[in-house]
């Protein structure tokens, strides 16, 4: 009679995580008699699996019943696979021997191979705001996932973004992998209701991608732009002068007065409009007692917006004119920067 | 669209050794199985070798065990085949294949000739 | 090692005649056999796997029957197009995957 092979009829066995695999084994005779192992791995670090003749491995079932004598075939099935369980897999046949039974044949091996679904792709923008047309940098990391093969995307308002750089680890194999992607997003003024979109598609999610999002209303600055005007008299020692605050985000904003330099008033943005692009408008107005100078007036609106070094706009008020008959200069003195904005 | 593109084949003196490449593309080659498959001139198929999805498991036909060595790159999408101390009758067209689950062959590429020739 | 052999080496016919080809195995292969057609200069095209089921593209005139040790490939009102080396290949069962001797359909 020929002598017993022992046929894994699988190179490779693909599961998904939380199924069972089905790992199959035949043996072509009877004869010798002995048991048979399931072992993962092959050499002195092999792991055992499983053991016809004893011990207790709750995730193993065999596809037939063992105990019956004519039985040749071996296969078994692994519940609740995780990609920890990728790796090659050796049914091994023994021969019945004492006082230990002896290694007579092993199978070719079967390859077990876990897909596993990415985690859910999460975005982070960088730590401090920007201003429109500057570059800023996101971030798009999952984890997890198997086979290695995996795409990403990136969008900002539903059009796709060429600028970025993507890398999946390890480069070698792995029984699971992570990515990360990072890319360049110029900022606009108009990007407060924008969205970064970071999409990953991979063959476990059967067509449907993962997305995480970053919302740039959470990295964008848009720095007001300043205008002080005068305002028809009220009474014939008074003036009204409005410092129009506009298109700036976030809303955190203080404003000063300064009359000739000295702080006036000081206050805090509050009952503000919300422009279509999500940028809001604010106003102040001071009224300004005439009778009380001697001298002309310097009228300073001083705007600090969100903790950025403070811009400012000037207007000049002659008190030797009939207030009546005072134009609106509105000659600029900058004391701070409009284009520097950082925390 | 599958697409299996062997390149590599040449004429070569027995003894000495060639390496195949099988580029592969439109399918996830991660997925397959893959095999090389032979057929000397005027001759029959004949199965070579074949490699697991991540290549851990290797099978080899009788005639080239020891001789030949199949590997693959899921990286680069690409299936190799070594050929190391070439004999006349290792003369053939080897064709790149895919396997299906259950091992038999859906896609064939165009095949790419060796021949050992003194 | 499972040894295939098919019969007839030479089939010779007509076009619109139905072809019929035999693939024996050595051994029990279950029902793990296919078959495939090559023409002059290409590839082989899987026609049949699972010793019954057609390859996605096969018309329907491509039949396969058989179980266990004996296989038949039929080809129904042969077209111009057929007429090529078919060959029976056993899997399932472990390596080596080993080919039939090919028949070839000659046009007569």
């Known amino acids: 009679e020929e002598e017993l092979q022992v046929i894994q009829p699988d190179k490779s066995v693909l599961v998904a995580a939380g199924e069972t695999a089905t790992l199959r084994c035949t043996a072509t005779s009877l004869i010798p008699v002995g048991p048979i192992q399931w072992f993962r791995g092959a050499g002195p670090g092999r792991e055992l699996i499983y053991n016809q003749k004893e011990g207790h491995f709750p995730r193993v079932t065999t596809v037939s019943d063992l105990t019956k004598r004519n039985n040749m075939d071996f296969s078994i099935r692994i519940g609740n696979i995780t990609p920890a369980d990728a790796g090659t897999y050796y049914c091994v046949k023994f021969r019945k021997g004492s006082p230990d039974d002896v290694e007579f044949k092993s199978g070719a091996g079967t390859e077990l191979s876990v897909r596993a679904k990415p985690s859910a792709p999460v975005v982070s923008g960088p730590a401090a705001r920007a201003t429109p047309q500057h570059t800023v940098s996101f971030t798009c990391e999952s984890h997890g996932f198997s086979p290695r093969d995996i795409t990403l995307k990136w969008f900002k308002n539903g059009n796709e973004l060429s600028d970025f750089q993507t890398n999946v680890d390890p480069v070698g194999e792995s029984v699971s992998y992570s990515i990360h992607s990072t890319a360049k997003v110029v900022l606009t003024r108009e990007d407060v209701h924008s969205q970064v979109i970071c999409e990953v598609a991979h063959v476990t999610l059967q067509g449907d991608p993962l997305r995480g999002t970053a919302n740039l209303s959470e990295t964008i600055r848009v720095p007001p732009t300043l205008e002080v005007t005068q305002q028809p008299v009220r009474a014939e020692n008074q003036v009204n002068v409005t410092c129009q605050v506009r298109k700036f985000y976030p809303q955190r904003l203080q404003l000063t007065w300064l009359e000739n330099g000295n702080v006036s008033r000081t206050e805090t943005a509050s009952t503000v409009t919300e422009n279509k692009d999500g940028t809001y408008n604010w106003m102040s107005w001071l009224l300004v007692n005439v009778s009380a100078h001697r001298d002309d007036v310097k009228l300073t609106c001083q705007v600090e917006h969100d903790g950025q070094p403070a811009v400012s706009k000037s207007h000049d008020l002659k008190v030797s004119a009939h207030p009546k008959e005072q134009g609106s200069n509105t000659a600029a003195e900058n004391t701070g920067s409009n284009e520097r904005n950082i925390y | 669209d599958v697409q299996l593109v062997e390149s590599g084949g040449g004429v070569v003196r027995p003894g000495e050794s060639l390496r195949l490449s099988c580029a592969a593309s439109?399918?996830?080659?991660?997925?397959?199985?893959m095999s090389w498959v032979r057929q000397g001139p005027g001759e029959g198929l004949e199965w070579v070798a074949g490699?697991?999805?991540?290549?851990?498991?290797?099978w080899y036909a009788d005639s080239v065990k020891g001789r030949f060595t199949i590997s693959r790159d899921n990286s680069k999408n690409t299936l190799y085949l070594r050929l190391f101390s070439l004999r006349t009758e290792d003369t053939a067209i080897y064709y790149c294949?895919?396997?299906?689950?259950?091992?038999?062959?859906?896609?064939w590429g165009l095949g790419t000739l060796v021949t050992v020739s003194s | 090692e499972i040894v295939l052999t098919q019969s007839p080496g030479t089939l010779s016919l007509s076009p619109g005649e139905t072809a019929t080809l035999s693939c024996r195995a050595s051994?029990?292969?279950?029902?793990?056999l296919a078959w495939y057609q090559q023409k002059p200069g290409q590839a082989p095209r899987l026609l049949i796997y699972?010793?019954?089921s057609r390859a996605t593209g096969i018309p329907d005139r491509f039949s396969g029957s058989g179980s266990g040790t004996d296989f038949t490939l039929t080809i129904s009102s042969l077209q111009s197009e057929d007429f090529a080396v078919y060959y029976c290949?056993?899997?399932?069962?472990?390596?080596?995957?080993?080919f039939g001797g090919g028949t070839k359909v000659e046009i007569k």
């Open positions: 294949a895919r396997e299906s689950w259950n091992t038999f062959f859906d896609y």
């Open positions: 439109g399918f996830a080659f991660s997925d397959h199985d």
């Open positions: 490699i697991s999805l991540r290549g851990g498991v290797t």
């Open positions: 051994q029990n292969v279950r029902s793990n």
């Open positions: 699972d010793a019954s």
């Open positions: 290949q056993q899997y399932g069962n472990g390596p080596p995957l080993t």
